[in-house]
């Protein structure tokens, strides 16, 4: 294999480069013969756009449609393959964006023929157009800095193509990343060009580099991972939830309580009830009934669903959430209307938090 020197996020030149020069790898759009292809010129502030194919001016015809920043090729044929460019002419300067179009029936049989992302279709490895590695979906790689809470899962991606199909390896802080370098190891999905680390810890902080290479060249991309240690706090409830609601007798209604808590939260839905015609006990405390709580037998405790409501269901519903640090609660009111009145969503009022101890 040729030797390489590692330069961050560049196309690394082998000792005998396969092409005369390579400034940057253009994006590749793949289509099967007969398909239509639409490409948007990814240049900003493009007042006037001109198009070229393999350096020759491209004009509209019965299969090529040029509308503003879009190029459409209808009923693509292999002759439409090539290096395309759109040039944005401005008053002070001009800028050009290059992309490849590859019309081939070498896409795996059975693959969706209408994929729009172009990320997953590669030239058949048996074909003769040998190619150095290139990125197939740079959108998935834009976020370089990942600041992640401890215990979360992290996924880094380097979707690439090339012929022959490149291999991918990962470095941590410039050195080979081995399974034994972290507790629990890591997962690599070659078909997805991804590295996955579960339950990250502070020692996982650092730079992670994917190196994608074949005999014609090598490219690499570096991500920085920062693991944010969790600071314990009592649960936080999203403002405005649960929201006041109204329904007719016999209707259904749902209250939603969105909870943010690093520590395991315990959710309770509580309603004020009456006993012997009184809302308060002898000790002056209100009578409360727990309608639902989080636990093994409770699905989606953040949602309280009430079905076939009666007038007796009207009243205040409290979402109370606690963890080992503290607790918080917010409430909403349910109005039950007689059958003849049409229900309407009441103005959503955030009931002031009523901190139950």
């Amino acid at each position: 294999r040729p030797s390489f020197s590692l330069v961050e996020d560049t196309t690394l030149e082998p000792e005998e480069p396969p092409t005369k020069y390579q400034i940057s790898q253009p994006e590749v759009y793949v289509a099967a013969p007969g398909e239509s292809l639409e490409v948007r010129c990814l240049l900003k502030d493009a007042a006037v756009i001109s198009w070229t194919k393999d350096g020759v001016h491209l004009g509209p015809n019965n299969r090529t449609v040029l509308i503003g920043e879009y190029l459409q090729i209808k009923g693509a044929t292999p002759r439409d393959s090539g290096l395309y460019a759109c040039t944005a002419s401005r008053t002070v300067d001009s800028e050009t964006w290059y992309f490849m179009v590859n019309v081939t029936d070498a896409i795996s049989s059975g693959d969706d023929e209408d994929d729009t992302d172009g990320a997953e279709d590669f030239v058949s490895e048996n074909s003769n157009n040998k190619r150095a590695p290139y990125w197939t979906n740079t959108e998935k790689m834009e976020k370089r800095l990942h600041a992640v809470p401890a215990a979360n899962t992290v996924k880094f991606r380097c979707p690439a193509g090339g012929n022959p199909m490149p291999t991918m390896r990962w470095l941590k802080n410039g050195k080979e990343f081995k399974q034994e370098h972290r507790i629990g190891g890591y997962k690599v999905r070659n078909q997805h060009w991804s590295l996955i680390m579960e339950s990250v810890v502070p020692s996982d902080k650092g730079n992670y580099t994917c190196v994608v290479e074949n005999e014609y060249g090598s490219i690499n991309h570096t991500y920085h991972l920062d693991v944010v240690e969790r600071s314990p706090h009592r649960p936080i409830l999203q403002a405005g939830l649960p929201a006041n609601a109204s329904t007719v007798v016999g209707g259904d209604v749902e209250f939603v309580c969105k909870v943010y808590s690093d520590a395991q939260p315990h959710i309770q839905w509580i309603k004020h009830v009456e006993k012997n015609g009184s809302k308060y006990g002898p000790d002056g405390l209100p009578y409360l009934k727990v309608l639902k709580h989080s636990g093994i037998n409770s699905s989606n405790a953040e949602v309280l669903a009430l079905f076939n409501v009666t007038e007796a269901d009207a009243g205040e519903y409290i979402c109370k959430v606690s963890n080992y640090i503290g607790q918080a609660n917010q409430s909403a009111w349910l109005t039950v209307l007689p059958k003849q009145q049409a229900p309407g969503r009441e103005k959503e009022i955030t009931a002031s938090p009523d901190y139950l101890e």
Epitope: S108, T153, K187, Q191
Partner: antibody
Amino acid sequence: EVQLLESGGGLVQPGGSLRLSCAASGFTFSDYAMSWVRQAPGKGLEWVSVIEGDASYTHYADSVRGRFTISRDNSKNTLYLQMNSLRAEDTAVYYCARERTYSSAFDYWGQGTLVTVSS
Amino acid sequence: DIQMTQSPSSLSASVGDRVTITCRASQDISSDLNWYQQKPGKAPKLLIYDASNLQSGVPSRFSGSGSGTDFTLTISSLQPEDFATYYCQQHYSPSHTFGQGTKVEIK
């Protein structure tokens, strides 16, 4: 036309074993990762396991890890799920599904095979 | 594992209604979220992949949005054939967990 056909389901006693198969046709089987997804009667979908196209990578849900084994024979275009130490809670319809390349979405599903674990 | 929480768990709607189903992940999952439709006795059907991409053959009244932890499936104008159960599924972590489902019923 892409087709996935599961077989091998049936009634088995707790602690017993069963091997499910999924015969694939209409696409280049070795190019695609495949998964098993199950659905207990009246319940939601539960992802069970995945295997990469070249079998270089496998992963399991916590609920089945150590008891179930996913495998594939690309020469036969067949996906397998070996289920050991079966429990009552493993009772479900088991679907095999093809993963859409790169996006890990299940774009084609089999019709499912019912596994009942009961004494 | 990453938990996926769907809401509502069920809803009643009429033909022509605009229906919105939400899915929330217990951590940031980028755009690694898919939506499926399932009818009784049938296998699920892929509707949306990677949060917002419409699967081939799926009507354009279905759309998906969101990234990070909060995602939405919208049916712009509910049709009779849309009454079904809808599931979200994350594929950010190795275990591709599903939401618990949202049943869309006829009002």
